[in-house]
C-alpha cells in the first residue's frame, strides 16, 4: 500500500556458530520528523509468533527470549531495528520476524542458520592386529559435536570413492549437536590408505581422517 512502512531484512540466512553472538539485521526508513515515541518494534518467532523482544511506548521492553536478545538503541532512530542474539544455540535456528509499526505497519522475516564445526575424525580399526591381505576389516571414522548433520565420504589411497559397505549414523546430544560415526567394511589388499571426510554442509568445512594399512604393522598418520 502507498506509504506503508517498508521493512527490510537480508534475503540470505544469517549463519551463526554455536556459542557466538548473531545479529539479525532489520531496517526501516524513518520519515522526516520521526521520533522513537512513534515506534513500535516487535521481534517474534515467525512460526509460533512467540514474542522475542519489543520496543514500544518509546522504550525498550526487553527480552522475552531467555534474556539473550538486545536491540541497538543508539541506532533505532536511524531505522536500524536489528536484533542481537547472544550465545546462539541449536534451538535458536529458524525464522524470526521483524515487525515495525509507525503510522502503519509492516513485517519481514530473516532466517537464522546455526552451525558448529565437526572435530577432526578419529579412526579405529577392527580387528587391529595380525592383519593379512584378504581379511575383512571395519574402519570406523568418528567426528563430534557438529551441526547440522554431516555429509560423510570415504575414499581409497588413489582417491577413488568408496560407497559400498558404508554405514553412517548421526546422533544428536542434549545440545542438539551431532556425533557422527561412519563404518566402512573393506577387504584388505596388500596395503592401502583409507580416508574419511566429514563435511559440514553449511560451513563448507571438511574434516579429514585416514588410516594406512601395510600388512603388518599398521600405522596411523600423525595428526595434521
Amino acid at each position: 500500500p502507498t506509504g506503508a512502512v517498508e521493512v527490510q531484512v537480508p534475503e540470505d540466512p544469517v549463519v551463526a556458530l554455536v556459542g557466538t553472538d548473531a545479529t539479525l539485521r532489520c531496517s526501516f526508513s524513518p520519515e522526516p520528523g520521526f521520533s522513537l515515541a512513534q515506534l513500535n518494534l516487535i521481534w517474534q518467532l515467525t512460526d509460533t509468533k512467540q514474542l522475542v523482544h519489543s520496543f514500544t511506548e518509546g522504550r525498550d521492553q526487553g527480552s522475552a527470549y531467555a534474556n539473550r536478545t538486545a536491540l541497538f538503541p543508539d541506532l533505532l532512530a536511524q531505522g536500524n531495528a536489528s536484533l542481537r542474539l547472544q550465545r546462539v544455540r541449536v534451538a535458536d535456528e529458524g525464522s524470526f520476524t521483524c515487525f515495525v509499526s509507525i503510522r502503519d505497519f509492516g513485517s519481514a522475516a530473516v532466517s537464522l542458520q546455526v552451525a558448529a564445526p565437526y572435530s577432526k575424525p578419529s579412526m579405529t580399526l577392527e580387528p587391529n592386529k595380525d592383519l593379512r591381505p584378504g581379511d575383512t576389516v571395519t574402519i570406523t571414522c568418528s567426528s563430534y559435536r557438529g551441526y547440522p548433520e554431516a555429509e560423510v565420504f570415504w575414499q581409497d589411497g588413489q582417491g577413488v570413492p568408496l560407497t559400498g559397505n558404508v554405514t553412517t549414523s548421526q546422533m544428536a546430544n542434549e545440545q542438539g549437536l551431532f556425533d557422527v560415526h561412519s563404518v566402512l567394511r573393506v577387504v584388505l589388499g596388500a596395503n592401502g590408505t583409507y580416508s574419511c571426510l566429514v563435511r559440514n554442509p553449511v560451513l563448507q568445512q571438511d574434516a579429514h581422517g585416514s588410516v594406512t594399512i601395510t600388512g603388518q604393522p599398521m600405522t596411523f598418520p600423525p595428526e595434521a
Epitope: P1, A4, V5, E6, V7, N40, I42, W43, Q44, T46, D47, T48, K49, Q50, L51, V52, S54, T56, A64, S95, T97, F99, S101, I102, R103, D104, F105, G106, S107, A108, A109
Partner: antibody, heavy 124, light 109 residues
C-alpha cells in the same frame, strides 16, 4: 474461544458513507490485527485493510486507500471500518477476521476467526 | 500486483484424499507468508481452517492439514467427508497486506 460479532445490515445511497463495527469477545484484543474483508455477490474474498489495536496503526489495500478508515477502541474491544463515497459496486458482505488467541505471542496478523458478516447494499 | 493462483475446481470422492494448492506470482511461498485457508459454504460466513501455514484453527477437524509443497501453500484433506464440499480460499501475508487467491471449488461425488 474468541468470537467476533458485527453490526447489522445497512442500506446506503451512492456517495454516502457506512461504518461497520466488529466486537471481539473471549480473548485478547490488543495485539491481534483485525482485518476487514469483503465479498461482492458471486465474487471472491477481497482484503480491504487491517488494524493492530495495540498500536492504533492501520494498513489499507491500495484499491481502498483514501476511501476506507479502520479504527479500534481498546476499551470496548471493538474495531470499526468506515467506507466513504459509496458506489453501487460496493454492495457486498463485509467481514472482520482475526487470529485465534495465542498466549505469549507478539503480533498476530491472521484470519482464523471470522465475524458473521454485515451486508451493505448501495442503491439509489 | 501480486497474483495468487488456485485450482478453479477439484473433484474427489468421500473417503479420498485431496490437496489444494496456492501459488504466488512473487515466487516460493514461505512460513513468513502465514498462509491461511478459509472455507466458504453457500449462505454461511467464511470459516478459518488453517493459519500460519499449518496451524489448525480451533474447531478445525484433524483431517485438514496445511503445509508448503514445492514452493506453494497446500491444504490437504485426508478422508474427505460430504460436508467438505465448499469453496476454499487461500490468503498470503506480504509484509503489510493480505492477498487472497481466487478460490477452489471442491466437489464431492
Amino acid at each position: 474461544q474468541v468470537q467476533l460479532v458485527q453490526s447489522g445490515a445497512e442500506v446506503k445511497k451512492p456517495g454516502s458513507s457506512v461504518k461497520v463495527s466488529c466486537k471481539a469477545s473471549g480473548g485478547t484484543f490488543s495485539n491481534y490485527a483485525i482485518n476487514w474483508v469483503r465479498q461482492a455477490p458471486g465474487q471472491g474474498l477481497e482484503w480491504m485493510g487491517g488494524i493492530i489495536p495495540l498500536f492504533g496503526t492501520a494498513n489499507y489495500a491500495q484499491k481502498f486507500q483514501g476511501r476506507v478508515t479502520i479504527t479500534a477502541d481498546e476499551s470496548t474491544s471493538t474495531a470499526y471500518m468506515e467506507l466513504s463515497s459509496l458506489r453501487s459496486d460496493d454492495t457486498a458482505v463485509y467481514y472482520c477476521a482475526r487470529d485465534f488467541d495465542a498466549p505469549g505471542s507478539g503480533v498476530n496478523f491472521g484470519m482464523d476467526v471470522w465475524g458473521q458478516g454485515t451486508t451493505v447494499t448501495v442503491s439509489s | 500486483d501480486i497474483q495468487m493462483t488456485q485450482e478453479p475446481s477439484l473433484t474427489t470422492s468421500p473417503g479420498g484424499t485431496v490437496t489444494l494448492t496456492c501459488r504466488s506470482s512473487t515466487g516460493a511461498v514461505t512460513t513468513s507468508n502465514y498462509a491461511n485457508w478459509v472455507q466458504e459454504k453457500p449462505g454461511q460466513a467464511p470459516r478459518g481452517l488453517i493459519g500460519g501455514t499449518n496451524k489448525r484453527a480451533p474447531g478445525t477437524p484433524a483431517r485438514f492439514s496445511g503445509s508448503l509443497i514445492g514452493g506453494k501453500a497446500a491444504l490437504t484433506i485426508t478422508g474427505v467427508q460430504p460436508e467438505d464440499e465448499a469453496i476454499y480460499f487461500c490468503a498470503l501475508w506480504y509484509s503489510n497486506l493480505w492477498v487472497f487467491g481466487g478460490g477452489t471449488k471442491l466437489e464431492i461425488k
